[in-house]
């Protein structure tokens, strides 16, 4: 999916109002210095591409993020403010229901969410630069 035509201001507002709080709650008990940020992004569409990938694509050591509250909210905001995004999710939703995994917060998941927080902050910064 090409995130170029999204309403970035609306996505930023949703992130600051609610998604950020859920990410921070997920990370509670860990320090910001516990993990190194290894994933970066260069512009707003690129940041959203990386955010989508880290949030919804299961990895061998962290398969459960898509069911978290911050992930559900991320999916909702992308569906709302990115033209045509929702239709790309119809088949993806069916597949996700089939591979529902037991919810376990592993260290790898915490590391992945730490990366997500960094990507979202980068997204906000690139937005501020544009303004």
């Amino acid at each position: 999916y090409d995130f170029t035509n999204c309403d970035f201001q609306k996505i930023e507002a949703d992130y600051l109002r609610t998604i950020s709080k859920d990410l921070i709650t997920y990370m509670s008990g860990t320090k910001s210095t516990d993990f190194n940020n290894t994933v970066s992004c260069s512009n707003r569409p690129h940041c959203l591409t990386e955010i989508q990938s880290l949030t919804f694509n299961p990895t061998p050591r962290c398969a459960s993020l898509a069911k978290e509250m911050f992930a559900r909210k991320t999916k909702a905001t992308l569906a709302l403010w990115c033209p045509g995004y929702s239709e790309t999710q119809i088949n993806a939703t069916q597949a996700m229901k089939k591979r529902r995994k037991r919810k376990v917060t592993t260290n790898k998941c915490l590391e992945q969410v730490s990366q997500l927080l960094g990507l979202w902050r980068r997204f906000i910064r690139t937005l501020l630069k544009k303004q």
Epitope: R17, K73, T77, A79, L80, G84, S86, E87, Q89, I90
Partner: antibody, heavy 120, light 107 residues
Amino acid sequence: QVQLVESGGGVVQPGRSLRLSCAASGYIFTDYAMHWVRQAPGKGLEWVATFIPLLDTSDYNQNFKGRFTISRDNSKNTLYLQMNSLRAEDTAVYYCARMGVTHSYVMDAWGQGTLVTVSS
Amino acid sequence: DIQMTQSPSSLSASVGDRVTITCRASQPISISVHWYQQKPGKAPKLLIYFASQSISGVPSRFSGSGSGTDFTLTISSLQPEDFATYYCQQTFSLPYTFGQGTKVEIK
């Protein structure tokens, strides 16, 4: 089963206000956006506004922004449409409809509608 | 805003006829089109979503096709209960917009 029930319609004079309600039941409220759609007598459907409980955000048709405001009471699973400075052209049946925001993404359930008549 | 133009605005047909209604979007919207049926005094009812996806409980005589800007709703064999008004809707981007409707009447 899913139920959406609108209320609050009636006859109102131009320039006055009215508040419509949409009570939702039979599903998880936060899994769906709620939309208001209206239909003037003998006319087509017109999208008015939406509220997304999961994100606590709303969006409006520019034609109504400033005059119409959405609010909600989560404890009652109820959505409201506050309509101010009403005009004769706001006369319509007002429907609420739900739409999945993390799945389905379509208005799959509608209320029965409530008629608003703006007349002096 | 994306405009949705439906045609025809009305048509007369007989029971058993094959009926085709078209909807054209003012810009490409991939497959983000849904079709509704509305009977007098009733709320719209979802028939087809995302251009061609069928809904459980909706008779198989209703089908949809198209992508980009041109979309079609087909009723393969019109039944007495199908006389109603049909609307297309786009949810590609806000504000969501509807076609002006096609009224299917008895010939």
